[in-house]
């Protein structure tokens, strides 16, 4: 930009160096030469002279508009052509933003993720401001009224040694730019509620070489929560369609989870947990590919034909996956899979 | 209960600096986020800066590059660094709690003056 620029004269903008984007603009550039009676004041944006919409107002003073100015950064300066110079004379530059009033942020959400030490809080920011947009967390003890804020850019981490003086508290997100100040919904939040047990893995696959063969997994966590509430999900990388089983884990133990397969196909497994009857989940754990032993008997086993698990099941749901196309999102979950519902949301998914 | 008391302020010409300083009492200052604001003559409160118990900060465009937010903890004390000043920036300061608004609560403020 055009911060230290020496003026020999000045520049302004209406209805400001920072405007909402689709705004007219008047630009003026006024002269302070010595020695210089301009013949011309000329206007240039990002380096290249503007041709139109220039007018002169008096000897020392000329304005630029722009209709519906729509670049959300832009470098201007003027300069003078003095009689018997060469070269133009620079008089003047700013650099000019436009853009948005931030929207309210919504879909706040906050998680302790287990050990972490921290409450993590995100929230959607809406539609892009292209300005600098700053978001102030409020966190407020429903016990002791006192009030904490935190600056952030798009997500905060807050120490749960700050919040050391109650389990209760109101959260909301203020967002704050040059062009205006929205808040979220408030939050109610128990420190309790919002735990999401530690990492979930799947450690290890194998088939056995029964009549009937049976795939195993098995799967663990570091998670010191005692009732643990986990969902399964699996399909083999041909197919677009999840099963997914449910369990209630004690994980002072490894899991083990067996499944009767199609034969000869490569299956891709993931696990998720939350603390049984919370709200939040892990995200999916990474998938897991497992490839299944060649058929020894002729029965063509079909997934959720036969569901044996060895822990406490319920239902198997049907899932449809989305494109394959979609990037690995690792972003907390909120939702959980309804039985039979398709998969939408938040949901991370693997083709 | 909450006490805050600022100074630092005086007579500058333009594209001078100036500290100002603001020394806290009566709460749990390092969890607190501060800001400061200002009121000039014939007009009304604007807010100026703020900085969360972080060390995190947020300025307002027309101060934005030339002053500067901090806190010590140690101390108990909120400062504005006012560099590159301008006659549109005398004002009375005053700091208060929370990193953003137009308000204060009954501070004295400082006198920034800013003049040739």
């Known amino acids: 930009g055009i911060t230290s620029i020496n003026c020999s004269g000045d520049m302004w903008v209406e209805p400001g160096e920072i405007f909402q984007m689709g705004m007219n603009v008047s630009i003026y550039c006024q002269e302070a030469l010595k020695h210089c009676r301009p013949r011309n004041l000329y206007f240039y944006k990002n380096g290249f002279k503007e041709e139109f919409d220039i007018t002169r107002i008096n000897r020392t003073t000329a304005r630029i508009w722009y209709k519906g100015f729509s670049e959300p950064h832009a470098y201007m300066h003027c300069t003078a052509e003095c009689p018997g110079h060469f070269q133009e004379t620079l008089i003047c530059g700013k650099d000019i933003s436009s853009g948005h009033p931030p929207d309210a942020p919504s879909n706040l959400t906050c998680v302790i993720y287990e050990y972490s030490g921290n409450m993590t809080c995100t929230w959607n920011t809406g539609k892009p401001t292209y300005i600098d947009t700053k978001y102030i967390v409020h966190v407020k003890s429903l016990e002791t009224e006192e009030e904490q804020q935190y600056l952030a850019s798009s997500y905060v981490k807050i120490s749960t040694d700050s919040l050391q003086g109650s389990r209760k508290y109101l959260v909301w997100v203020q967002a704050v730019n040059s062009l205006g100040m929205e808040n979220s919904q408030q939050l109610h939040v128990h420190l309790d509620d919002i735990v999401i047990p530690s990492a979930s893995i799947i450690s290890r696959a194998e088939t056995t070489n029964d009549t009937v063969p049976k795939t195993i997994v098995y799967w663990k966590s570091k998670t010191m929560i005692e009732k643990v509430f986990c969902e399964m999900r699996y399909k083999t990388t041909t197919n677009q369609t999840w099963s997914v089983k449910e369990f209630d884990a004690n994980f002072t133990y490894v899991q083990q989870s067996e499944f009767y397969l199609e034969p000869d196909s490569k299956y891709v497994f993931q696990v998720r947990c939350q603390e049984t009857g919370k709200r939040n989940w892990q995200p999916w754990s990474s998938p897991f590919v497992h490839q299944t032993s060649q058929e020894t008997g002729k029965r063509n086993w079909q997934p959720w034909s036969s569901p044996f698990v060895h822990q406490t099941s319920q239902t198997v749901s049907q899932v449809t996956a989305k494109s394959s196309h979609e990037p690995q999102k690792m972003e907390m979950l909120s939702a959980t899979i309804f039985r039979g519902h398709p998969a939408s949301g938040n949901h991370q998914d693997i083709g | 209960q909450v006490q805050l008391q600022e100074s630092g302020g005086g007579l500058v010409q333009p594209g001078g600096s100036l500290r100002l300083s603001c020394a806290a009492s009566g709460f749990t200052f390092r969890l607190t986020a501060m800001r400061w604001v200002r009121q000039a003559p014939g007009k009304g409160l604007e807010w100026v800066s703020g900085i969360d118990s972080r060390g995190s900060t947020i300025y307002a465009d027309s101060v934005k590059g030339r002053f500067t937010i901090s806190k010590d903890n140690a101390k108990n004390t909120l400062y504005l660094q006012l560099n590159s000043l301008k006659t549109e920036d005398t004002a009375m300061y005053y700091c208060?709690?929370?990193?953003?608004?137009?308000?204060?609560?009954g501070s004295l403020g400082t006198q920034v003056t800013v003049s040739s």
């Open positions: 208060a709690q929370g990193v953003y608004g137009d308000t204060y609560s």
